[in-house]
């Protein structure tokens, strides 16, 4: 039977819910799937259920709630129905389903190189997702940066931070690194998707040679 797979709010002002629509072998033919929702502002279950306001904007098998249908103050319950019967149901607060869009505009600058010329430190910077509306203050994001050498499989994770830049220390010179960042609403919600990978290539030792070395 169809099941909810995910509900997500990228910025606490809108949200969308997605479901599976697999027809399993041997199951009876289901009618069209409809999503109904209610805001849980009463303890009575007799409250009104309304149909999904937008089945299109969030893609196939989804329902999108724009800002006119989204309020963070009251939890929501949603249900999938087919042929008049409920096939799945869930309730949540918008704060529970916050998953920000990926950070953008990653870049890096060289901070310094070790005296041996073997290691270098870099500063990685990025911007919050455009729709997070940090200025408005509804979103306080914390970020997690991960990095690894290109040929490695395991990512190294840095501690979560609240700023949009962080130093990464002791990278090996003449190795290429991959860096990615993701964010979450501070204290609630889940991490969103990772940013696009930033490639960091540290130049050869000779390119860092100081003038004094020639004297």
């Amino acid at each position: 039977e169809p099941k909810f797979t995910k509900c997500r709010s990228p910025e606490r002002e809108t949200f969308s819910c997605h479901w599976t629509d697999e027809v399993h072998h041997g199951t009876k033919n289901l009618g069209p799937i409809q999503l109904f929702y209610t805001r849980r502002n009463t303890q009575e279950w007799t409250q009104e259920w309304k149909e999904c306001p937008d089945y299109v904007s969030a893609g196939e098998n989804s329902c999108y709630f724009n800002s006119s249908f989204t309020s963070i103050w009251i939890p929501y319950c949603i249900k999938l129905t087919s042929n008049g019967g409920t096939v799945d149901e869930k309730c949540f607060s918008v704060d529970e389903i916050v998953q920000p869009d990926p950070p953008i505009a990653l870049n890096w600058t060289l901070l310094n190189v070790s005296l041996t010329g073997i290691h270098a430190d870099i500063q990685v910077r990025w911007e919050a997702p455009r729709n997070a509306d940090i200025q408005k203050g509804w979103m306080v994001l914390e970020y997690e940066l991960q990095y690894k050498e290109v040929n490695e499989t395991k990512w190294k994770m840095m501690d979560p931070i609240l700023t949009t830049s962080v130093p990464v220390y002791s990278l090996k010179v003449d190795k290429e690194y991959e860096v990615r960042v993701r964010s979450k609403q501070r204290n609630s919600g889940n991490y969103g998707e990772f940013s696009e990978v930033l490639y960091v290539t540290l130049p050869q030792m000779s390119q860092f040679t100081c003038e004094e070395d020639f004297y």
Partner: antibody, heavy 124, light 107 residues
Framework: EVQLVESGGGLVQPGGSLRLSCAAS????????IHWVRQAPGKGLEWVAY????????YYADSVKGRFTISADTSKNTAYLQMNSLRAEDTAVYYC?????????????????WGQGTLVTVSS | DIQMTQSPSSLSASVGDRVTITCRAS??????VAWYQQKPGKAPKLLIY???SLYSGVPSRFSGSRSGTDFTLTISSLQPEDFATYYC?????????FGQGTKVEIK
């Protein structure tokens, strides 16, 4: 019996700081949300800030953003409003108010209990 | 921000009168409107939530209704203890906003 008791108000100079407390009894702070609302002398009600202890989420009015910080200590069943860089226009009675959360994702669209208020006066 | 335009700002009435106070939201707020009563020097008290639900312990002479973005608080028969200031509040958008208040005075 549900009760909210504010404390920490007083006279402070512009640019100064105060920390208001809101001690809750008769219910668990973790399962409800706390809002701060203020009322300038002779004026109407203005919503200031919100915290949900269960979700760790906060919101602020534009007028206090970056200057005020709301927090909660669930072990003490107390919410706080840290007010920095205070201005004359922050002079008001400050109330904490509860938004009730019930079983199975139910929440009331209102503040059902309010504290008695604490007066904050910002003046040189 | 969602504006809540409350009217009238004040009114004079006698005991036993039917009193109506209205609030208009600047955009849709569903039924997420509450009404409060406040007396001088006291904290507000909840009367109505979710536009029309009477809060526990509130006398039945108080009622609330909704028509689109217009919300009404009605006191069917004004009692001496009802002379106070009344506020509407929208609980839909961020930030939460209040109407400017209606002072109900004795005629």
């Amino acid at each position: 019996e549900v009760q909210l008791v504010e404390s920490g108000g007083g006279l402070v100079q512009p640019g100064g700081s105060l920390r208001l407390s809101c001690a809750a009894s008769g219910f668990n702070l973790y399962s409800s949300s706390i809002h701060w609302v203020r009322q300038a002398p002779g004026k109407g009600l203005e919503w200031v800030a919100y915290i949900s202890s269960s979700y760790g989420s906060t919101y602020y009015a534009d007028s206090v953003k970056g200057r005020f910080t709301i927090s909660a200590d669930t072990s003490k069943n107390t919410a706080y409003l840290q007010m920095n860089s205070l201005r004359a226009e922050d002079t008001a009675v400050y109330y904490c108010a509860r938004q009730y959360y019930g079983y199975h994702y139910y929440a009331q669209e209102a503040f059902d209990y309010w504290g008695q208020g604490t007066l904050v006066t910002v003046s040189s | 921000d969602i504006q809540m335009t409350q009217s009238p700002s004040s009114l004079s009435a006698s005991v036993g009168d039917r009193v109506t106070i209205t609030c208009r939201a600047s955009q849709s707020v569903s039924s997420a409107v509450a009404w409060y009563q406040q007396k001088p020097g006291k904290a507000p008290k909840l009367l109505i939530y979710s536009a029309s639900s009477l809060y526990s312990g509130v006398p039945s002479r108080f009622s609330g209704s909704r028509s689109g973005t217009d919300f009404t608080l009605t006191i069917s028969s004004l009692q001496p203890e009802d002379f106070a200031t009344y506020y509407c509040q929208q609980f839909w958008g961020t930030p939460i906003t209040f109407g400017q208040g209606t002072k109900v005075e004795i005629k």
